[in-house]
Amino acid sequence: CNLSQTHSLNNRRTLMLMAQMRRISPFSCLKDRHDFEFPQEEFDGNQFQKAQAISVLHEMMQQTFNLFSTKNSSAAWDETLLEKFYIELFQQMNDLEACVIQEVGVEETPLMNEDSILAVKKYFQRITLYLMEKKYSPCAWEVVRAEIMRSLSFSTNLQKRLRRKD
């Protein structure tokens, strides 16, 4: 499977849209900053077989999609930008799904390292809990937007490393 240039373009567009979604200055939200403990080691990509990396990347996309497609999220962001963001995420998830079918050798490889997947899920659970505790305030959403941008850039780097392996 070739995580093509198109996929790379999608990644850049996703990050660009996240940047455009910003509604308030991060500096006005410094008191709301929070360490969500992003599981960075799961995106190092060295310990991964390709199938497992694909799986972790998809988890990241799906959880991001889930987070930003809630009612509370729809109220917090510009609808047009949000829809464009969904489209990019959806396209990337489709590409990754197709990769599992196309990838030679994936059949023999376990599709997941359960610890990695659970680490990503727990990371998003921490984000969801934070938003609930902060009652979905504009500053809380801004902190989360910045956090997701950071984590998506780790995903992008992992994808670049996978492409170099191709």
Epitope: Q62, F90, I101, L111
Partner: antibody
Amino acid sequence: EVQLLESGAEVKRPGSSVRVSCRASGDTFSSYPISWVRQAPGQGLEWMGRILPALGVTNYAQNFRGRITITADKSPLTAYLELSSLRFEDTAVYYCASPSADIIPSILGTTLFAFWGQGSLVTVSS
Amino acid sequence: EIVLTQSPGTLSLSPGEGATLSCRASQNVSRHYLTWYQQKPGQSPRLLIYGGSSRATGVPDRFSGGGSGTDFTLTISRLEPEDFAVFYCQSYHSPPPVYTFGQGTKVEIK
């Protein structure tokens, strides 16, 4: 846990259309597709199509293209199946089905149906 | 388009016996995208096995899935009275997304 509740049984004339609804409740996400699957009396299961409610993106099985329309509302999360130009052989139980957000890894989630509605019987009869 | 053929059509067995159900694909299917369901009369289907071999929540360990390429199996090690039903295999292919079901295998009490 997701609950899917479908609309009641319908009797339709050949050539007419039917609209079946499926309301989702519980741990629902508009970021997961909802599919329609039908089962003719004494027969097997047949996938008809799906919709991603967050985007309204649809995919239809080849057999139904031109006769099928799937739509959705995001709040409350509800999917609709409309089938036109009904024939006798469209008599079936129509199920809505969705993945589970708890399936790990999520890449497998959209490839299967973890939750099913109770089914809605559509009878085509003259 | 992928065609899934299940065999046998009907399997007549007694409680306590083992059962092996076959699902053959007309072309290669990713085992990760192969799913099994159980359906009892008058009920909706129930997810049993996904990803080729992972049991869904609440599914007893007497059910197991295996196989790769074009040949897949569902094995029930010891049939319990509540296991008698119709079993369907289902594959997924993308893009575009297509879900295909086998015609089903009925496991009935002998």
